[in-house]
């Protein structure tokens, strides 16, 4: 008959890391339905009275919403139609961090799916020459890491040597207190070779290369989320 | 497009109060936060607080907390904004604007044209 | 409550020139900063609002960057027009804050 809620429609989760201080998405996906003025889409944390976010009728309902995302979500309401619950959240803090669900109502019928939301901090490390040490150096940087990661240096030319003995890494704490700027100085390098700076967490993992040969230097680097659905 | 169109400018006796309007076209007035703002020459502008037309909901700076009064009319698509026992100080331009964002709280991104209130006996 | 301390709070600048505006927020860390150009008569207009992204129909010569507690903005290839006072708002948290406003004058 497909009655509203006498079936099962299929809805995905994507787990996701939100960058505090920055906006994150939780991302949520489900069996289009063009009639907009049917569909239901209700956020949920788990421990939290109150919902997240809703959104019916064709816009949002904040009547049962929790203070603490007050003013701080929104649906792309624009994307409901075909299929898209992603939730956009302002401001991500520590707090923010646990299990959420993502209920669906539709003239098809109804799901839900959870997804597990972690919080901290990441960001691209950039790798420049050190010219001022007495030995050819490189120094790896990065802005804003939460919780405290590690860092690995590895070469091309002598894959699988350890570095740990040739290079320094130090945490500065951020003037907000929560968040650390890391800085890698690794030692004694050689030209016309490839070094990576590897910062990692248990929410993000951010590489660094760079190539020093007579004639240039380049780099590249890239950050990836773990976990990532 | 959007436009906030803003009540005139008035002249108010100290102790009494004032109610200026805020009337938005362009867009789904209950969808998005109007936060409200006043602006004194040499003083740059100050947040007063924002309303959520949708809800009623409101947050306030706590300096301005029983002094302004933020409410929303649905029907008609206008924010209020009533200001009690004025002062001297109380004698400068208000501005409204829509919130980006929808229900999320963003940026300032239209404003109205200001509603300019002198508190003088 | 977050205070955003803006700086200078007025400056001359040539035509075709270039000048760069900086807030600093007390407290707190996030992306969550926009700038305004406010002309006598008129009302603001949002420039640049999340540190760096430029409203629509915004120039280019228009510019903001930042990160943590320290912002800032920039205009390059001054024209005539951009004679005005330029505000930076502080839009991530509870309560909003403004910065104290710079006044530009172009030469």
């Known amino acids: 008959f497909g009655i509203s809620g006498k079936h099962f429609i299929t809805v995905t989760t994507f787990t996701s890391a939100g960058n505090i201080g920055e906006d994150g998405t939780l991302s949520c996906t489900f069996e289009p339905d063009i009639k907009l003025n049917g569909i239901v889409i209700q956020w949920l944390k788990e421990g939290i009275k109150g919902l997240v976010h809703e959104f019916k009728e064709g816009k949002d309902d904040l009547s049962q919403q929790h203070e603490m995302f007050r003013g701080r979500t929104a649906v792309f309401a624009d994307q409901v139609v075909v299929g898209n619950a992603s939730l956009r959240l302002k401001n991500v803090q520590l707090t923010d961090a646990g299990t959420y669900t993502c209920y669906i109502r539709t003239s098809k019928g109804k799901g839900n799916a959870n997804l597990e939301y972690k919080t901290g901090a990441f960001s691209m490390p950039e790798i420049n020459v050190d010219y001022n040490a007495s030995s050819e150096s490189l120094r790896c940087e990065a802005p804003r890491w939460f919780p405290q990661p590690t860092v690995a240096w590895a070469s091309q030319v002598d894959q699988g040597a350890n570095f740990s003995e040739v290079s320094n890494t130090s945490f500065e704490l951020n003037s907000e207190n929560v968040t650390m700027k890391v800085v890698s100085v690794l030692y004694n390098v050689t030209i016309n070779n490839t070094y990576s700076c590897m910062i990692e967490n248990d929410i993000a993992k951010a590489t660094g290369d760079i190539k020093v040969t007579d004639s240039e230097v380049k780099r590249r680097s890239q950050l990836q989320l773990l976990n990532s659905g | 497009q959007v436009q906030l169109q803003q009540s005139g400018a008035e002249l108010v006796r100290p102790g009494t109060s004032v109610k200026m309007s805020c009337k938005a076209s362009g867009y789904t007035f209950t969808s998005y936060w109007i936060g409200w703002a006043k602006q004194r020459p040499g003083h740059g502008f100050e947040w007063i607080g924002d309303i959520y037309p949708g809800g009623g909901y409101t947050n306030y700076n706590e300096k301005f907390k029983g002094k302004a009064t933020l409410t929303a009319d649905k029907s008609s698509s206008t924010a209020y904004m009533q200001f009690s026992s004025l002062t001297s100080e109380d004698s400068a331009i208000y501005y409204c604007?829509?919130?980006?964002?929808?229900?999320?709280?963003?940026?300032?991104?239209?404003w109205g044209q200001g509603t300019s209130i002198t508190v003088s006996s | 409550d977050i205070q955003m301390t803006q700086s200078p709070s007025s400056l001359s600048a040539s035509l075709g020139g270039k000048v760069t505006i900086t807030c600093k927020a007390s407290q707190g860390f996030n992306k969550y900063v926009a700038w305004y150009q406010h002309k006598p008569g008129q009302c603001p207009r949002l420039l640049i609002h999340y540190t760096s992204t430029l409203q629509p129909g915004i120039p280019a010569r228009f510019s903001g960057s930042g990160s943590g507690r320290d912002y800032s903005f920039s205009i390059s290839n001054l024209e005539p027009e951009d004679s005005a006072t330029y505000f930076c708002l502080q839009y991530g948290n509870l309560l909003y804050a403004f910065g104290g406003g710079t006044k530009l004058e172009i030469k």
């Open positions: 604007a829509r919130l980006d964002g929808s229900s999320y709280r963003g940026a300032m991104d239209s």
